[in-house]
């Protein structure tokens, strides 16, 4: 089940050649940050720029084979961003007590940089991915996941934390971005929209997908998240777009079927362990990678983002369940929980495959607009 190929088989987003403004449409509210009058003069990185130790390889793990009928970004037609009707989800509100502004939310005031100065940093997430501008990096090998197939017991905590639905993962889920780049999975959560309104955080050529899954990992160089915040490579997130397909996704149904139990903000339930890798695309070899930030306050930078080229298919009913079941702060529906895309500010997104090369017969001399900076350069 693939969408018909467009653009003579070129990867998604064959035509754009702008710089940091998605499609060059500055007036699209959800594709840029809100006005940057709060930008500090310099970078708002948290302390710590040293390289991470650790050069051991994970045990050899076979990359997953591609499932038949899976949808890939390159199979999708290029979509011009119509301009999302919602405002940028980039703000927080004042705490009920008045002076404490850490109780952030999506939408409203004050801006997130008042909650955490790092949210005004120069290397923030999410971003708009333009395959044509991505640098093909052959050194980016297939991701390696070990221990992601969990037994039913012990059960896992599924919580509505007021910002998302979060599944806390047990110890033992190992992930490697490459040799010496080893991580442990901590939790996964989702971002979504509302009825008829997509809610992925990252976009591709301005196209926003219905939803997005994030699996958050901590570098093995650190024992705790608070130590890793702001450190380059301290945290790594695997991200995948969720797309509407004709069939129910049985892996996701194990979580979505329990959302009614945690409809209220702060509520939680226990769910049997499941195959976490089944929530991700099957093709671990084709992805985009860049260094960014957490997409919620404190917006700490140094986060390695890996965005799968392949998408995950859920049924329309499942996507509706995701976006229409949970409640957030102040008796409001938990919807549209995504941050506006942030400027690249000179960052180059790397691709593990030649995403920017037009493979159509018309392209006699395929051109890659950005070259890969090999690890360690």
């Amino acid at each position: 089940q693939r969408l018909p190929r467009m653009q003579e088989d070129s990867p998604l987003g064959g035509g754009s050649s702008g710089e940091d403004d998605p499609l060059g449409e500055e007036d699209l509210p959800s594709e840029e940050d809100s006005p940057r009058e709060e930008d500090p003069p310099g970078e708002e990185d948290l302390p710590g720029e040293e390289d991470l130790p650790g050069e051991e390889d994970l045990p050899e793990v076979k990359p997953k084979s591609e499932e038949e009928g899976s949808l890939k970004l390159e199979d999708l037609p290029t979509v011009e961003a119509p301009g999302d009707p919602q405002e940028p989800q980039n703000n927080a509100h004042r705490d009920k007590e008045g002076d404490d502004q850490s109780h952030w939310r999506y939408g409203g005031d004050p801006p997130w940089p008042r909650v955490s100065p790092a949210c005004a940093g120069r290397f923030q997430s999410p971003v708009d991915i333009r395959p044509q501008l991505a640098a093909f990096c052959p050194a980016l090998r297939p991701l390696e996941l070990l221990g992601f197939q969990l037994p039913p017991l012990p059960e896992l905590r599924l919580r509505n934390n007021g910002h998302s639905v979060q599944l806390t993962l047990p110890p033992g889920l190992e992930m490697a971005l490459g040799p010496g780049r080893e991580y442990r999975a901590l939790q996964l959560h989702l971002h979504w929209g509302a009825a008829g309104r997509p809610g992925s955080e990252h976009t591709v050529e301005g196209h926003r997908f219905p939803a997005e899954i994030h699996v958050v990992h901590l570098s093995t160089a650190f024992a705790r998240v608070d130590e890793a915040l702001g450190r380059p490579g301290g945290l790594a997130v695997l991200a995948a777009f969720l797309e509407e397909g004709p069939e129910e996704n049985s892996a996701y149904e194990q979580l979505l079927s329990r959302l009614e139990e945690i409809a209220e903000e702060g509520s939680e339930t226990q769910v049997p362990g499941l195959d976490i890798s089944a929530l991700l695309p099957s093709d671990f070899s084709r992805y985009f990678q860049y260094e960014g930030s957490l997409t919620t306050p404190p917006c700490a930078q140094g986060v390695i983002w890996t965005v799968f080229n392949q998408t995950v298919m859920l049924s329309a009913k499942q996507l509706h369940t995701l976006s229409d079941t949970l409640w957030g702060p102040g008796d409001s529906r938990l919807q549209l929980n995504f941050r506006a895309t942030q400027p690249l500010n000179g960052r180059v997104i790397e691709a593990s495959f030649p995403a920017g090369v037009d493979s159509s017969p018309r392209a006699a001399e395929p051109v890659q607009l950005n070259s890969c900076l090999a690890a360690g350069d």
């Epitope: 109780h103 910002h163 901590l186 958050v216 705790r224 915040l229």
Partner: nanobody, 117 residues
Framework: QVQLQESGGGLVQPGGSLRLSCAAS???????????MAWYRQAPGKQRELVAV???????QYSSSVKGRFTISRDNAKKTVLLQMNSLKPEDTAVYYC????????WGQGTQVTVSS
Amino acid sequence: QVQLQESGGGLVQPGGSLRLSCAASGGARNIFSFAAMAWYRQAPGKQRELVAVITSAGGTQYSSSVKGRFTISRDNAKKTVLLQMNSLKPEDTAVYYCNADYYQDYWGQGTQVTVSS
């Protein structure tokens, strides 16, 4: 290094009150405001059970066994979370643990609460 430190436990008669406090220290202070904070308890020979949760936005949830008797609150400026326990019953006897959920779980060492006449 200690990240979360509980205090306020002790021996109290049925029907009495106690106020538990949990203070964040070290690196946990940096993530406190963004964490969902919770109190769990574990009675001898039983599994650890959730008592109350307060999200970073202030939403609260309680287990059915304590609803209406316990109140959870947080002070982000002081990096503390409180559990006010009223109308205590013998079955509330347990070790009470403070928990911060910010991408991973942070736990305190626990404080003993004994309800007995």
